[in-house]
């Protein structure tokens, strides 16, 4: 921690004579500049410079040539690194007076003259002195008005709204300052500070608007802080609503967007009277261009149970705004299809949600479906199929004679999705078939038996067994299954010299 | 041809309010292509922006002016009008009502620049 | 606020003669910077608008450069018409601001 700089000459104040010259020396353990009083037109009689010295100190001397009323004033030196805008410069001061019997009172910028008090709060009527001797009266419309006065700051006290004068008398000449107009303004010891942002997401060569408002208070300072910045991109504005309330509104817009434009945008709003302080922030993202991304929430191959309700959801960021479409086997899904329905729903600002329903699977419902995503920019696609899942069921079961070899081939004709297996079995007894335990199921090995299996379509399979020779009458079952179900048929294959007679149980 | 004409007191003492009305002709204050504003001129001060405002009632103003003034609009006459109160000495000036142009960028329309201006209207704060 | 300081204050030259005015902004403003002619007893009038742009109606004499914080306006030549106050005016920052002005005076 450094301490203070100091300053010679070692006093609070000083009288300097009217078209003097004095000099003020400042000595850190850091390097140290000076503040001083400058009028409107940055005063060329004040000229500062460094000067070595051995004592291992920093010295900065401050000169004034010709010195005038308007030299007078509060001088602080302070360390570099301390200064920052928004607090009282911490330092070691000075006052320097500059009596001159033609300038009474310190001249002052025009916004001097306006004077801002909160409710009943005090507040400093700025009119100094360049003589710390020189009495001074403070007049109202409704004459002398009795606060207490310090020549370094003015008048504080308690004022109502209205034009207020000082006066002096100098060797005899009298000396008033144009008025000083005080105002009451609305303010809040809280700031209500809100931000808004209709859109955080940008392409470029668009313009990107954010406004912050601020309710109740008309004191207040509002500091931009955004990418652009430092070229000075953006443009401010600040309008004025009065009515049912005070409410300021701030907007920052930056047209002709660039990539180099995505950061924080921040606004801080500081109340001028006191130190009040509200900051609001959003991430503004440019892109170079527009774009798409699909997330679908399921795989590309999907199953569904027949008479099932199903929705697959698909979630989408994309901007600007997209069309979205859903194909079946490449043609537009027809909207009045009371069955299979599609919506879209936005989450966020460049969140969708597309959802596609089945209503009750039907086995047209299988085929390849697409979500189209479009923009402006850019068109991505997802395309998965479905499957609507059939249990297994048979469709025919029949025998054929093979005439006078007296061999027959059943043939079993079954439909499922996926498409079933089919198994079959036989019973030799043909009086004891009733029992489960007398039905043997059919091996692929065995010699006088031939098995085999043919899909007709992605639905439909059929299963035929041959048996070279039939030599007594014996029955055989059809057992065609798939994940949702089996079923089963049986028949009667009779001996040919027992004059075959089909029966289908 | 667009035309803009002032009218109001040259003379306002201390204190008091200063009133000034703006009647434009050849053109409507209700277009969406513009702003309507006020600035003044004075050999202190130079050239300064006073307040503007936008059809749709918006109305834009100077925070050093914005606690003493009031800009209102009658569209039914095509005029806007200016009220300074409390005005001292330092508001004495060349007071101008002026037509803004505008930029529109797809989010809305924002200020441009001082495009037609009117012949000026000189006001003196004495006593 | 933007502080706009322009230079010279004055700039005393002949006709024919080639004029460069300069307005250097406290912050940068991008390009949103315009430029406006005034004579006696004139309202002022718009010459150059975003930096560059020639306002309607106005010769080509009339140039504007510049973005950011420093910004030019030229007049190649100068006819007689053209001995004014020149006034930059930014639109960036809020409020909008004007330069203190340039003179051009003939020699």
């Known amino acids: 921690q450094l301490s203070l700089p100091s300053i010679l000459p070692n006093e609070n104040e000083k009288v300097v004579q009217l078209n003097s010259s004095f000099s003020l020396r400042c000595f850190g353990e850091s390097e140290v500049s000076w503040h001083y009083p400058t009028s409107e037109e940055e005063n060329p009689n004040v000229e500062i410079r460094n000067e070595e010295n051995n004592s291992g100190l920093f010295v900065t001397v401050l000169e004034v040539v010709n010195a005038s009323a308007a030299h007078t004033g509060l001088y602080t030196c302070y360390y570099n690194h301390t200064q920052t805008d928004e607090n009282e410069i911490e330092g070691r001061h000075i006052y320097i007076y500059v009596p001159d019997p033609d300038v009474a009172f310190v001249p002052l910028g025009m916004t001097d003259y306006l004077v801002i008090v909160e409710d009943d709060d005090s507040a400093i009527i700025p009119c100094r002195t360049t003589d710390p001797e020189t009495p001074v009266t403070l007049l109202s419309n409704d004459g002398v008005v009795h606060a207490s006065y310090d020549s370094r700051q003015g008048f504080n006290g308690t004022f109502s709204v209205g034009p207020y004068i000082c006066e002096a008398t100098v060797r005899g000449k009298k000396f008033q300052t144009i008025p000083f107009n005080v105002y009451a303004l609305k303010a809040t010891s809280e700031l209500d500070l809100e931000m808004e942002a209709l859109k955080t997401v940008y392409k470029s060569g668009e313009t990107i608007v954010v406004t912050c408002a601020v309710f109740n208070n008309e004191v207040v300072d509002l500091q931009w802080t955004y990418p652009g910045e430092v070229k000075g991109k953006g443009i401010t504005m600040l309008e004025e609503i009065k009515v049912p309330s005070i409410k300021l509104v701030y907007t920052l817009r930056v047209p002709e967007a660039t990539v180099k434009d995505s950061g924080d945008y921040e606004c801080a709003a500081r109340q001028a009277t006191k130190e009040v302080k509200e900051m609001k922030k959003v991430t503004i993202s440019v892109h170079e261009k527009g774009f798409i991304e699909i997330k679908p929430n399921f795989s590309q191959l999907e199953a569904v149970d027949l008479h099932e309700v199903k929705h697959f959801v698909v979630d989408v960021q994309a901007y600007p705004p997209p069309r979205i479409s859903w194909l079946k086997d490449n043609l537009t899904l027809i909207e009045n299809l009371t069955e299979i329905t599609t919506d879209i729903e936005r989450t966020q600002e460049i969140r969708y949600r597309s959802k596609l329903k089945l209503i009750r699977a039907k086995e047209e419902d299988s085929g390849h479906y697409t979500i189209v995503v479009q923009n402006e920019d850019d068109v991505k696609s997802y395309t998965f199929e479905l499957l609507t899942q059939v249990p297994s069921s048979i469709l025919d079961l029949v025998d054929d004679h093979h005439g006078s070899t007296g061999g027959q081939t059943v043939r079993c004709i079954a439909e499922g999705t996926p498409l079933p297996d089919i198994e079959w079995m036989i019973c030799k007894d043909i009086k004891k078939c009733n029992n489960e335990t007398s039905w043997a199921i059919l091996a692929n090995n065995i010699s006088n038996i031939i098995t085999e299996v043919h899909p007709r379509d992605r639905s439909t399979v059929e299963g035929r067994v041959t048996f070279t020779r039939v030599e007594e009458t014996i029955a055989v079952r059809c057992l065609a299954k798939n994940l949702l179900g089996a079923e089963s048929r049986e028949l009667k294959l009779v001996a040919p010299t027992l004059r075959s007679e089909l029966t289908v149980a | 041809q667009l035309q803009l004409q002032e009218s109001g007191p040259g003379l306002v003492k201390p204190s008091e309010t200063l009133s000034l009305t703006c009647t434009v002709s050849g053109g409507s204050i209700q277009s969406s292509s513009y702003y309507w504003g006020w600035l003044r001129q004075s050999p202190g001060k130079g050239l300064e922006w006073i307040?503007?405002?936008?059809?749709?009632?918006?109305?834009y103003y100077n925070p050093s002016l914005r606690s003493r003034l009031t800009i209102s609009v009658d569209t039914s006459k095509n005029q806007f009008s200016l009220m300074l109160s409390s005005v001292t000495a330092a508001d004495t000036a060349v007071y101008y009502c002026?037509?803004?142009?505008?930029?529109?960028d797809g989010s809305g329309n924002y200020y441009g620049w001082f495009d037609r201006w009117d012949q000026g209207t000189l006001v003196t704060v004495s006593s | 606020e933007i502080v706009l300081t322009q230079s010279p204050a004055t700039l005393s030259l002949s006709p024919g003669e080639r004029a460069t005015l300069s307005c250097r902004a406290s912050q940068a403003v991008s390009s949103y910077l315009a430029w406006y002619q005034q004579k006696p007893g004139q309202a002022p009038r718009l010459l150059i608008y975003?930096?560059?742009n020639r306002a309607t109606g106005i010769p080509a004499r009339f140039s504007g450069s510049g973005s950011g914080t420093d910004f030019t306006l030229t007049i190649s030549s100068l006819e007689p018409e053209d001995f004014a106050v020149y006034y930059c005016?930014?639109?960036?920052?809020?409020?909008?601001?004007f330069g203190q002005g340039t003179k051009v005076e003939i020699k």
């Open positions: 307040g503007s405002f936008f059809y749709t009632g918006s109305t």
């Open positions: 005016q930014q639109r960036s920052n809020w409020p909008p601001a």
């Open positions: 975003d930096a560059s």
């Open positions: 002026a037509r803004q142009s505008t930029y529109y």
